[in-house]
């Protein structure tokens, strides 16, 4: 059974992940056309189901494409280097989902824009945090 300290650690990690994802989303929402138009043509795979920490496997598998689009659309106003940002997210995701269990991610039938993708994972983090508090 999870201890209160491990639950607290999980909660802090999820909050950190949530902040990172929100920071990316805020950065994108500040982009003006035509950059935003271009970014929205970059498609992401969405999880069929995302209710448990193991489902973060689906996020992990899309981190490389996320870094790719952030690099391509790198703005002089975006102060964090995409590589560092995604690397931080990757470390948190690996710790949260655990490396002991191998989970095969199942994706939804339709791909989504970067905004829909980020919102989906932001909602996931908020949902899990709410169950922990």
């Amino acid at each position: 059974a999870p201890t209160s300290s491990s639950t607290k650690k999980t909660q802090l990690q999820l909050e950190h992940l949530l902040l990172d994802l929100q920071m990316i989303l805020n950065g994108i929402n500040n982009y003006k056309n035509p950059k935003l138009t271009r970014m929205l043509t970059f498609k992401f795979y969405m999880p069929k189901k995302a209710t448990e920490l193991k489902h973060l496997q689906c996020l992990e598998e899309e981190l490389k494409p996320l870094e790719e689009v952030l690099n391509l659309a790198q703005s002089k106003n975006f102060h964090l280097r995409p590589r560092d940002l995604i690397s931080n997210i990757n470390v948190i995701v690996l710790e949260l989902k655990g490396s002991e269990t191998t989970f095969m991610c199942e994706y939804a039938d339709e791909t989504a824009t970067i905004v829909e993708f980020l919102n989906r994972w932001i909602t996931f983090c908020q949902s899990i945090i709410s169950t922990l508090t």
Epitope: T37, T41, S75
Partner: antibody, heavy 121, light 113 residues
Framework: EVQLVQSGAEVKKPGESLKISCKGS????????IGWVRQMPGKGLEWMGI????????RYSPSFQGQVTISADKSISTAYLQWSSLKASDTAIYYC??????????????WGQGTTVTVSS | DIVMTQTPLSLPVTPGEPASISCRSS????????????LDWYLQKPGQSPQLLIY???YRASGVPDRFSGTGSDTDFTLKISRVEAEDVGVYYC?????????FGGGTKVEIK
């Protein structure tokens, strides 16, 4: 090997309908946009439009909007270009192309072999 | 639509000699915020499908020899071949993808003298 294989040459009469295909293999079909390019006899290249098989998001060049329909069936990794009523001026070679996870950020790195469409009475 | 204009229409070349093709766009292809210039070059060899040579102004596509290079800024672009080889003959096209719809130049036919 990453490739796009197109359907064979077609000879049609004006007013007839037609659907040509482009099958992708050697890569994850739903990760990349598939575009269509026209080349009329002895002429240059014209970009017609594009589809994302992952969600069927489709964009047309204004010059081709309403003239053709672009579609895809991701279950068989195939994109289509179709006409409901062909005209003699549709006579051309049609190429399908692969264009990255975003058609703005990537060039057309893979091309089909082309489908020759001849429309003549 | 962005209009792409290529010159010359035809370019006779001598193997081993350098060659260059020009392309001009009706508006800037540079996104100054990103620092990306959304211009590609394609080669269509006789009887073949076109192939990507250069993307985003100056990046060589996979398998493209280093004798090909792309340069330019804003609205004026050049494809250079440092030493032309017989296999380089065909029609070269520039294409912009900064704005919808994507548009090609009219093409430059490179042939051996």
């Amino acid at each position: 090997e990453v490739q796009l294989v197109q359907s064979g040459a077609e000879v049609k009469k004006p007013g007839e309908s037609l659907k040509i295909s482009c099958k992708g293999s050697g890569y994850r079909f739903t990760s990349y946009w598939i575009g269509w390019v026209r080349q009329m006899p002895g002429k240059g290249l014209e970009w017609m439009g594009i589809i994302h098989p992952g969600d069927s998001d489709t964009r047309y060049s204004p010059s081709f909007q309403g003239q053709v329909t672009i579609s895809a069936d991701k279950s068989i990794s195939t994109a289509y270009l179709q006409w409901s009523s062909l005209k003699a001026s549709d006579t051309a070679i049609y190429y399908c192309t692969r264009q990255g996870r975003s058609f703005y950020y990537y060039g057309m790195d893979v091309w089909g072999q082309g489908t020759t469409v001849t429309v003549s009475s | 639509d962005i209009v792409m204009t290529q010159t010359p229409l035809s370019l006779p070349v001598t193997p081993g000699e350098p060659a260059s093709i020009s392309c001009r766009s009706s508006q800037s292809l540079l996104d100054s915020d990103e620092g990306n210039t959304y211009l590609d070059w394609y080669l269509q060899k006789p009887g073949q499908s076109p192939q990507l040579l250069i993307y985003t102004l100056s990046y060589r596509a996979s398998g493209v020899p280093d004798r090909f290079s792309g340069t330019g800024s804003d609205t004026d672009f050049t494809l250079k071949i440092s030493r032309v080889e017989a296999e380089d003959v065909g029609v070269y096209y520039c294409m912009q993808r900064i704005e919808f719809p994507l548009t090609f130049g009219g093409g430059t036919k490179v042939e051996i003298k």
